[in-house]
């Protein structure tokens, strides 16, 4: 067990907080719950803290929660390949570039640590080139969200991760907003960290509304498995 | 040392607004749980509302529900409280409390009256 992973056998406090600027729309929010790495599980609630959120919930969940991968489930035999753990608690950078199909894009930066006992997701979001009546800025994504498999590789010269992914947003006319992420993660402190061989995470998300919350908000519940690595031939045999 | 510097308060007609400020010194850390708290003459302390660490949690007694709202501005450390529809039943002396050991945690009771710093108290009489 890394040092780092020993911090995540309870449930841990969650904070996010994020300054975002969209097409020089500006606006904050921020995110508390907790998470259970034991089960992969996140609870988290989000406010706007600047009003009316000017860009649809949906293309914010990778930001926040697939910004606290630390809390992802890795299986006995691949917890070897858990970077996001062993790196806390310094924490790590976590830089991202998310393409919007025919669309803008947003460039995000977050620091994740622990502060205290809780784990902190410090982000800033400036997202460009967005359309004023395309389906991000015109709020055409369905208040939903799919499943997806997020590829994360060894960077041996950054003491990090690269991680792909493509995210599938649902929109109200049936079809599909793609959102391709190019993700960068290197550790804030200088001890050792575990860099992984391929392998990915699946993850499920599930959005909904607290019915006694006025301001603009989301709540999330989702489930982080990581995955594709195998059990060696030994462990077959035994 | 953690101090709690409160302002506000005053006198105010029945079905008035008043606004509580309480401000936050000499901690860094992470920014702490924080409550509103009210003595009534000749009664016990008793619990007003409460906001979680980012401000996204917030509980309310029943007594205030649907007229008091809690709220925070990190960036200036401060907590408020903006009391609508003032009750003769309201006037009491109102105390900001602090939890550091909350922390970020906001799946914790609210309610507890054993929090780590307390404001020094600021007077709301409301009169019929």
């Known amino acids: 067990m890394s040092k780092g992973e020993e911090l995540f056998t309870g449930v841990v406090p969650i904070l996010v907080e994020l300054d975002g600027d969209v097409n020089g729309h500006k606006f904050s929010v921020s995110g508390e719950g907790e998470g259970d790495a034991t089960y992969g599980k996140l609870t988290l609630k989000f406010i706007c803290t600047t009003g009316k959120l000017p860009v649809p919930w949906p293309t914010l969940v990778t930001t926040f929660s697939y910004g606290v991968q630390c809390f992802s489930r890795y299986p006995d035999h691949m917890k070897q390949h858990d970077f996001f753990k062993s790196a806390m608690p310094e924490g790590y950078v976590q830089e991202r570039t998310i393409f919007f199909k025919d669309d803008g894009n947003y460039k995000t930066r977050a620091e994740v640590k622990f502060e205290g006992d809780t784990l902190v997701n410090r982000i800033e979001l400036k997202g460009i080139d967005f359309k004023e009546d395309g389906n991000i800025l015109g709020h055409k994504l369905e208040y939903n969200y799919n499943s997806h498999n997020v590829y994360i590789m060894a960077d041996k010269q950054k003491n990090g991760i690269k991680v792909n992914f493509k995210i599938r947003h649902n929109i109200e006319d049936g079809s599909v907003q793609l959102a391709d992420h190019y993700q960068q993660n290197t550790p804030i402190g200088d001890g050792p960290v575990l860099l992984p061989d391929n392998h990915y995470l699946s993850t499920q998300s599930a959005l909904s509304k607290d019915p006694n919350e006025k301001r603009d908000h989301m709540v999330l519940l989702e489930f982080v498995t990581a995955a594709g690595i195998t059990h060696g031939m030994d462990e077959l045999y035994k | 040392q953690v101090q709690l510097q409160q302002s506000g308060g005053g006198s105010v007609q029945a079905g008035g607004s008043l606004r509580l400020s309480c401000t936050i010194s000499?901690?860094?850390?992470?920014?702490?749980?924080m409550a509103w708290f009210r003595q009534r003459p000749g009664k016990e302390r008793e619990f007003v509302a409460a906001i979680s660490s980012g401000g996204v949690y917030t509980y309310y007694a029943d007594s205030v529900k649907g007229r008091f709202t809690i709220s925070r501005d990190n960036a200036k450390n401060t907590v408020y409280l903006q009391m609508n529809s003032l009750k003769p039943e309201d006037t009491a002396v109102y105390y900001c409390a602090a939890d550091f050991r909350r922390g970020g945690n906001w799946n914790v009771d609210p309610f507890r009256y054993d929090y780590d710093y307390w404001g020094q108290g600021t007077q709301v009489t409301v009169s019929s």
């Open positions: 000499g901690r860094t850390s992470i920014n702490p749980y």
